[in-house]
């Protein structure tokens, strides 16, 4: 899908509204010098390229993210958001209902949501190199 | 906890240059963005620039340009802001400041570095 | 670059009263507003982030509304420890810019 027509200031209101506080309850207990952000983005869109890669996809050590609350209102956010979004994930959605694991929250699932903060601070104020 | 400590007063002669540090601790130091306000006496607060002490990439106000130069020592988690060709102008408290976990705002600032640039 | 225009500059008020403080950006800056609180000799402190949401341990005295290019804050019911200066800033796009202040004093 390509985030570059999303109303990202929409986005953003979402995001500092309510997921982002969802993202802190998941992190509670975390020492905040724990996880040194590795995933980088460049631009709104491309951070939420990232975004919905690390929301959604399953990765080794970490199959659970996608029926946690935060992940539930970003695909929220999206859909209503991003034109034609919601089109893109229904196939997704169906591979994702039989995939669907109990949810355990490992170290690795933290480390994914730290990198998932660390991508939404850009989305919000993407740093963009000085001319 | 989150701390930024910076250096010393400073008094400096004009035309000279200065360079402030403001050491982070209690957070990924990488992580996050360090922003640079000043504030002359009785004055508001005038934001200076930003650097992503992760890659170095910086971002000036205009006003600044040319003689402002913002770094970053990822091993000491330690970032500097140095201002050259110092005028009378100049003198102010200036602060650094940590973004927010949101990326929305700044959640915490360094105590104050007093620079007075006196002939 | 985003003009930030404080008003009032100065504001006089006594314990126990309602105050409320307004910024206007010179353009449209959606929600990306922060409020600071600032005591003479200190750094400043974050109030309220995305024009509406309080920072963690800011009492609830506090609120910020407006979008667009009309932000206010209000305080439901001055407290001694309220008196000090605040500022707006803009945090839509770099270079971020500060409001010009509002100093609030006891009557």
């Known amino acids: 899908y390509d985030f570059t027509n999303c109303d990202f200031e929409k986005i953003k209101a979402a995001y500092l509204s309510t997921i982002s506080k969802d993202l802190i309850t998941y992190m509670s207990g975390t020492k905040s010098t724990e996880f040194n952000n590795t995933v980088s983005c460049s631009n709104r869109p491309h951070c939420l390229t990232e975004i919905q890669s690390l929301t959604f996809n399953p990765t080794a050590g970490c199959a659970s993210l996608a029926k946690e609350m935060f992940a539930m209102k970003t695909k929220a956010a999206l859909a209503i958001w991003c034109p034609g979004y919601s089109e893109t994930q229904i196939n997704a959605t169906q591979a994702m209902k039989k995939r669907r694991k109990r949810k355990v929250t490992t170290n690795k699932c933290l480390e994914q949501v730290s990198q998932l903060q660390g991508l939404w601070r850009r989305f919000n104020r993407p740093l963009l190199k000085q001319q | 906890q989150v701390q930024l400590q910076q250096s010393g007063a400073e008094v400096k002669k004009p035309g000279a240059s200065v360079k402030v540090s403001c050491k982070a601790s209690g957070y990924a130091f990488t992580n996050y963005l360090i922003e640079w306000v000043r504030q002359a006496p009785g004055q508001g607060l005038e934001w200076m620039g930003v650097?992503?002490?992760?890659?170095?990439?910086?971002y000036y106000s205009q006003k600044f340009q040319g003689r402002v130069t913002m770094t970053a020592d990822k091993s000491t988690s330690t970032a500097y802001m140095e201002l050259s060709s110092l005028r009378s102008e100049d003198s102010a408290v200036y602060f650094c400041?940590?973004?927010?976990?949101?990326?929305?705002?700044?959640?915490?600032w360094g105590q104050g570095t007093t620079l007075t640039v006196s002939s | 670059d985003i003009q930030m225009t404080q008003s009032p500059s100065s504001l006089s008020a006594s314990v126990g009263d309602r105050v409320t403080i307004t910024c206007r950006a010179s353009?449209?800056?959606?929600?990306?507003l922060v409020w600071y609180q600032q005591k003479p000799g200190k750094a400043p402190q974050l109030l309220v982030y995305g024009a509406r949401n309080l920072a963690d341990g800011v009492p609830s005295r506090f609120s910020g509304s407006g979008s667009g290019t009309q932000f206010s804050l209000t305080i439901s019911s001055l407290q001694p420890e309220d008196f000090a200066t605040y500022y707006c800033?803009?945090?839509?796009?770099?270079?971020?810019?500060f409001g010009t202040g509002t100093k609030l004093e006891i009557k």
């Open positions: 650097i992503n002490p992760e890659s170095g990439d910086t």
């Open positions: 800033q803009h945090f839509y796009e770099t270079p971020l810019t």
């Open positions: 400041a940590k973004e927010s976990l949101t990326g929305s705002s700044y959640d915490y």
């Open positions: 353009e449209n800056i959606y929600s990306n």
